[in-house]
Amino acid sequence: EAHKSEIAHRYNDLGEQHFKGLVLIAFSQYLQKCSYDEHAKLVQEVTDFAKTCVADESAANCDKSLHTLFGDKLCAIPNLRENYGELADCCTKQEPERNECFLQHKDDNPSLPPFERPEAEAMCTSFKENPTTFMGHYLHEVARRHPYFYAPELLYYAEQYNEILTQCCAEADKESCLTPKLDGVKEKALVSSVRQRMKCSSMQKFGERAFKAWAVARLSQTFPNADFAEITKLATDLTKVNKECCHGDLLECADDRAELAKYMCENQATISSKLQTCCDKPLLKKAHCLSEVEHDTMPADLPAIAADFVEDQEVCKNYAEAKDVFLGTFLYEYSRRHPDYSVSLLLRLAKKYEATLEKCCAEANPPACYGTVLAEFQPLVEEPKNLVKTNCDLYEKLGEYGFQNAILVRYTQKAPQVSTPTLVEAARNLGRVGTKCCTLPEDQRLPCVEDYLSAILNRVCLLHEKTPVSEHVTKCCSGSLVERRPCFSALTVDETYVPKEFKAETFTFHSDICTLPEKEKQIKKQTALAELVKHKPKATAEQLKTVMDDFAQFLDTCCKAADKDTCFSTEGPNLVTRCKDALA
């Protein structure tokens, strides 16, 4: 229904706290360099204005669209051109072009320092002094580093953060209470960020149809007892919610997500028997819980899908009459029977089925042509299954750090032109798949591994798009989203690459490395490893292991030495010489 004042409508629906949080996220995601105080001031102004509209919907400007209101606020910021360069040109445009322009200027890799967590005492002091400001800082810092973070989900993580601080700041040993809990939230939030970015990429590059197909597969796996009409309704609503969030319409997105959660909880009987626990929770927790609810028990008996999709004499007629609906039912029927497959795999199977029908339904004897289609799925299914087995075996053998190194070598060989920091970040993230997925039960491994890898590779593609350097990466990133992971997996050593010259300074280390946290030490070593591969792309695993073991021994020795500086300056050059010899 139409409302006289959109801003009053959203303020009323969301309540002041969520309204303010979402406006802060929106501004932080659009203008990523502004300070918290600058954004907080704008948020307060917008909130005060929303209140006047709630009091009187026909007050001046209350009938304006949210894009107009927010865009006008952003464009009124002083020194916009000085701070943001060509983004200021967006302000010369009218809506909806202005908002599109802002979206295009979102930076997936902003040059901001890493978000450092203050030490426990300081954190608790500022939290106790002003919890609202403290949480505002959290929303601002996360949102500007992750400009596509799913806004209502970020409110959920802020709520988690709040609960952890409330609990731990009352403890004697604040540090040991906070650290593991906040690490857990950070890890989950980072995964949530790359997953959501993948959804927005799907929407931006391939449109709503592609996202809706993803949603149909995912929802059918989770709710195998829901009928196709129910799955379609949920997929349509979920697509709308994600379209809004990806498009920067965060108030509408959060409001519609709450509506969807309400609908699901009111219709549990036709959706799933597993929703009640989620539905008993307050709003943010409820929506989060529903988004990762366990799969419902499969129906006691389901037939094979061949009867409807291969053996039926009307296959081509049914397909021609309503292509998307027919393919949608195929995806639904296949997905509800296979919670053990990744969504990416299910979409590849549906794509193969579609291509087969396109080809066969134009032939003289269609049934003879498409009759073997289900058997032709075999290589598509076996490829990711083998990937999971190979990689999980390797992870179990090497552990997370060793597994990351193996992936780093592999990917540096595939795309040696990519910058070392990007390769290290990608390998570290890809390597976490072992810890995340390989310990799961057999039937959960494939969906976990492949859908996580796809999300990480999407980030690789986004970073590469900014500065394209590798034809291999461009090739894999240009294709469809579901083909990316198999494309990257199939890449081999880039034969066109001219090895980097050996520069001693790249492998020269100083005693300051000894005091770095373990994570930073690992990154330094992995940076050196990537550089080694760029110098010798065809080095064997044995050669690289020899060099890295030598390097680890050198660090261990010098960091234990009484005179660390002397050790580094005398032993360092020896290490460099040994490295060159080992790789010769």
């Epitope: 008996d301 389901l302 037939p303 899908i305 299914v381």
Partner: nanobody, 123 residues
Framework: EVQLVESGGGVVQPGGSLRLSCAAS????????MGWFRQAPGKERERVVS????????YYADSVKGRFTISRDNSKNTVYLQMNSLRPEDTALYYC????????????????WGQGTLVTVSS
Amino acid sequence: EVQLVESGGGVVQPGGSLRLSCAASGLTFSSYAMGWFRQAPGKERERVVSISRGGGYTYYADSVKGRFTISRDNSKNTVYLQMNSLRPEDTALYYCAAARYWATGSEYEFDYWGQGTLVTVSS
């Protein structure tokens, strides 16, 4: 440890009948679709028939429709294959297999396999 043990194979004349059995252990039988596959000498393994978890649905290969019947007894953790009107081209090693998730009845969906039982149709 999951085990599937086939029995009932043997030599039979064309037009004759055989009943194969497959006893399963080490898995929750009623949670698995079951299937029979066969491999003739020098040929690829092929799908024969499969049956849904509850036994309400079956899916036959065209070559055996009307001659073979699959059934299961979940209380006995056993699946059966009644083979009538046997032909020389039915000669093969018959494998029993179990699939936790079942959509197409194709080989790649089956997680566990038996060692096979030999059926020879010859006059």
